[in-house]
């Protein structure tokens, strides 16, 4: 099954089931693990472990839980209020260009260059020229919580967030 | 793939609104999943608001919600963040991102699409 939430994976859900509580929204808005009713009166749990809300919101669905790719290891499991946390499998990471899968880490470094990196789930080793010091890397940012993507990452706003 | 610019922001006093545009060109928006981040200076991305372009109904996060709305303008293509009661934390680069499929709205790695972003200064 993809991991991916598509329009088709949003339907409404018109009636809630008996374990699916209600309560009313405040301010227009329904809290986290919740969506709205189809006539806004009432804010509907999400199922736990199938779907999710992270954020207050007026939504009338609640968003399918991810699930984890072969290749990738659960970190943490879909909860009403977080989506699943997915990490690539020891040996394998996620890289900048191509989000949407783990691949290989490299065994070694190129002739003339040294190891001055590990492989992690999210980058490949890190290899620096002998003499220069200059790196050989596919580096990528520091894993932010959900580790999982749709192709592409952008370039502009998160080469500048840290 | 599709193409968004920002615009809106600029200069504003605590308290006051802006409504940010996040025009789209290059493809129809029915079925994408749009967010609204931002970028404080020093900080890393933020996640304010998330819609599907052709479904009612947005989620916002803590620090907006209330004071935020996010609408959508079928015949213009166009995104909106309507912001009111600024406050001095609001000031950043906000981006609009766009995607056909997501795995978690909430994460920028999530979205292929970005506008180059629009400045919101909030201070007196």
């Known amino acids: 099954e993809s991991a991916l939430i598509t329009q088709q994976d949003l339907a409404p859900q018109q009636r809630a089931a008996p374990q699916q509580k209600r309560s009313s929204p405040s301010e227009g808005l329904c809290p986290p693990g919740h969506h709205i009713s189809e006539d806004g009166r009432d804010c509907i749990s999400c199922k736990y472990g199938q779907d999710y809300s992270t954020h207050w919101n007026d939504l009338l669905f609640c968003l399918r839980c991810t699930r984890c790719d072969s290749g990738e290891v659960e970190l943490s499991p879909c909860t009403t209020t977080r989506n699943t946390v997915c990490q690539c499998e020891e040996g394998t990471f996620r890289e900048e260009d191509s989000p949407e899968m783990c691949r290989k880490c490299r065994t070694g470094c190129p002739r003339g260059m040294v190891k001055v990196g590990d492989c992690t789930p999210w980058s490949d080793i890190e290899c620096v020229h002998k003499e220069s010091g200059t790196k050989h890397s596919g580096e990528v940012p520091a894993v932010e919580e959900t580790v999982t993507s749709s192709p592409g990452t952008p370039a502009s706003p998160c080469s500048l967030s840290g | 793939e599709v193409q968004l610019l920002e615009s809106g922001g600029g200069l504003v006093q605590p308290g006051g609104s802006l409504r940010l545009s996040c025009a789209a060109s290059?493809?129809?928006?029915?079925?994408?999943?749009m967010s609204w981040f931002r970028q404080a200076p020093g900080k890393g991305l933020e996640f304010v608001s998330y819609?599907?372009?052709?479904?009612?109904?947005?989620a916002y996060a803590d620090s907006v919600k209330g004071r935020f709305t996010i609408s959508r303008d079928n015949s213009k293509n166009t995104l909106y963040l309507q912001m009111n009661s600024l406050r001095a934390e609001d000031t950043a680069v906000y981006y609009c991102?766009?995607?056909?499929?997501?795995?978690?709205?909430?994460?920028?790695?999530?979205?292929?699409?970005w506008g180059q972003g629009t400045l919101v200064t909030v201070s007196s």
């Open positions: 991102a766009a995607s056909m499929a997501v795995r978690t709205y909430y994460s920028p790695r999530s979205y292929d699409s």
């Open positions: 290059g493809r129809a928006l029915t079925g994408y999943h």
């Open positions: 819609g599907i372009w052709d479904r009612a109904g947005a």
